[in-house]
Interface confidence: low
């Protein structure tokens, strides 16, 4: 049978089994989510894209799944990230009381996976899926992350932190999920401040990357939304993580502050 050929890689092999297994594991480890029925979660996930044209997925398609995966993060404990996922995840594994989107049920289920279906069939397409650039932006994976990222930002409160990659030419990128979705969905009535941590990724000079033009752009966007903005350089990510793990280490001085220069705006 003829099948549409997309530019992106196909659905991750054993996708249904992976989602179900991840759900079971997550609900076992997180007592507050033990009430979740993983079969219902999979059915809702499947319902968002199965038998639908994969370039015409909407946020509405994911609402049943979002409803089932409703979860709250305590105030001051939300960690957003952009182009530096691995370090953000290493950090929350050590600092157990902070949470990235991928530490929440829905983010955990979908992290690093690809999926799509086909119009009018109940099959999952393991051959190819739409590429965001080459095919379409309204594909199942992109719309999923846009939906859950929006929700994650909307529910954040207190001081929100974001890790940014100082090795990129655009440290803050308006086209990233953080720049295009999360920044605009932080709620000023609940969020007092956004604190950016600019990760130097091994860069060995002492430039203050908080003065980068793209960071100034982020500050401007955030300030216009009546949210205060702070920025810190983290010159040594390895040292930073080490000091989070072991704040008593004599080389860490006053906790994590030893590894970054504080810059207030």
């Amino acid at each position: 049978r003829w099948r549409q050929q997309w530019s992106g890689s196909g659905t991750t092999s054993r996708f249904p089994e992976t989602v179900l297994a991840r759900c079971v594991k997550y609900t076992e480890v997180h007592p507050e989510m033990r009430h979740v029925d993983c079969q219902s979660v999979w059915d809702a996930f499947k319902g968002a894209f199965i038998s639908k044209y994969p370039c015409n997925i909407t946020e509405e398609d994911y609402q049943p799944l979002v409803k089932l995966g409703t979860q709250t993060v305590p105030c001051n404990k939300t960690l957003l990230w952009s182009r530096i996922k691995d370090l953000a995840h290493q950090f929350t594994q050590v600092q157990r009381d902070m949470f990235t989107l991928e530490d929440m049920l829905l983010g955990y289920l979908a992290d690093d996976l690809t999926w799509c279906g086909e119009f009018n069939t109940f099959e999952i397409n393991y051959q190819s899926c739409p590429d965001w650039r080459k095919d379409c932006s309204n594909n199942p994976v992109s719309v999923f992350w846009k939906t859950v990222s929006r929700r994650f930002a909307e529910t954040a409160c207190g001081v929100v932190h974001v890790m940014l990659n100082g090795s990129r030419s655009k440290i803050f990128d308006k086209n990233s999920t953080f720049g295009s979705v999360e920044v605009h969905n932080l709620q000023p009535e609940k969020v007092q401040a956004l604190e950016a941590w600019v990760i130097h990724g091994g860069r060995e000079d002492s430039r203050d990357l908080c003065q980068d033009p793209t960071i100034k752009e982020l500050e401007s966007i955030i300030s216009k939304r009546n949210i205060r903005f702070f920025c810190k350089n983290i010159y040594r990510p390895d040292k930073f993580l080490q000091c989070v793990k072991n704040p008593e280490d004599s080389s860490c001085l006053s906790g994590i502050s030893a590894s970054h220069h504080h810059h207030h705006h």
Epitope: N165, S169, G201, G202, E204, D205, S206, R207, D238
Partner: antibody, heavy 120, light 111 residues
Framework: QVQLVQSGAEVVKPGASVKMSCKAS????????MHWVKEAPGQRLEWIGY????????NYNQKFQGRATLTADTSASTAYMEISSLRSEDTAVYFC?????????????WGQGTLVTVSS | DIVLTQSPATLSLSPGERATISCRAS??????????MHWYQQKPGQPPRLLIY???SRATGIPARFSGSGSGTDFTLTISPLEPEDFAVYYC?????????FGGGTKLEIK
């Protein structure tokens, strides 16, 4: 003492790829950037980019982005550079180099160089 | 990119004389009170060797006859008095901005 030992000379055909290595010893491999520098005949030295083995983070000179790939094997204290779609102008000696450390971004230690000859 | 222009391209001198090599940057390489300009010596078949870092600081083990000066866009490497082993190619390098760039080199040859 700090030592950077690079792999031997390579002769490769245009369009092919080459992967060279740089084995580090005498210091904590994960704590310092490993840079790569190109020296082509009659040309000025060119900085290709670096990898931070501590987290795999890379920073490339735009000119080499896409064709040069920097990786590191922390268990073997070895950094690698792969260059794809080779052409004659890639004929050069490639050096790995380490800087003095945090905020000391000048090249204190160098490998002996790997000569890559692109020839059909 | 910051372009570094070295002059002269070739310098012919005798041992005991004074060598002055200039490096001009297309824009200032000063930051945080430092000139992010460094100097290297390279001999045939060898990697470059760091001589001077941050415009004027001598690297470990480098003799006092090597000195660096300058700020902003204009930097100078001075070698005095010249020893026979100093005849080589000299490069300046900046790391104020990515991509880090090198000058075209100055060949110091025996007259």
């Amino acid at each position: 003492q700090v030592q950077l030992v690079q792999s031997g000379a390579e002769v490769v055909k245009p369009g092919a790829s080459v992967k060279m290595s740089c084995k580090a010893s005498g210091y904590t491999f994960t704590s310092f950037n490993m840079h790569w520098v190109k020296e082509a005949p009659g040309q000025r030295l060119e900085w290709i980019g670096y990898i931070y083995p501590g987290n795999g983070g890379t920073n490339y000179n735009q000119k080499f982005q896409g064709r040069a790939t920097l990786t590191a094997d922390t268990s073997a204290s070895t950094a690698y550079m792969e260059i794809s779609s080779l052409r004659s102008e890639d004929t050069a000696v490639y050096f790995c180099a380490r800087t003095g450390g945090l905020r000391r971004a000048y090249f204190t230690y160098w490998g002996q160089g790997t000569l890559v000859t692109v020839s059909s | 990119d910051i372009v570094l222009t070295q002059s002269p391209a070739t310098l012919s001198l005798s041992p005991g004389e004074r060598a002055t090599i200039s490096c001009r940057a297309s824009e200032s390489v000063d930051s945080y009170g430092n000139g992010f300009m460094h100097w290297y010596q390279q001999k045939p078949g060898q990697p470059p060797r760091l001589l001077i870092y941050l415009a004027s600081s001598r690297a470990t083990g480098i003799p006092a006859r090597f000195s660096g000066s300058g700020s902003g866009t204009d930097f100078t490497l001075t070698i005095s008095p010249l020893e026979p082993e100093d005849f080589a190619v000299y490069y300046c390098q900046q790391n104020k901005e990515d991509p880090w760039t090198f000058g075209g080199g100055t060949k110091l040859e025996i007259k």
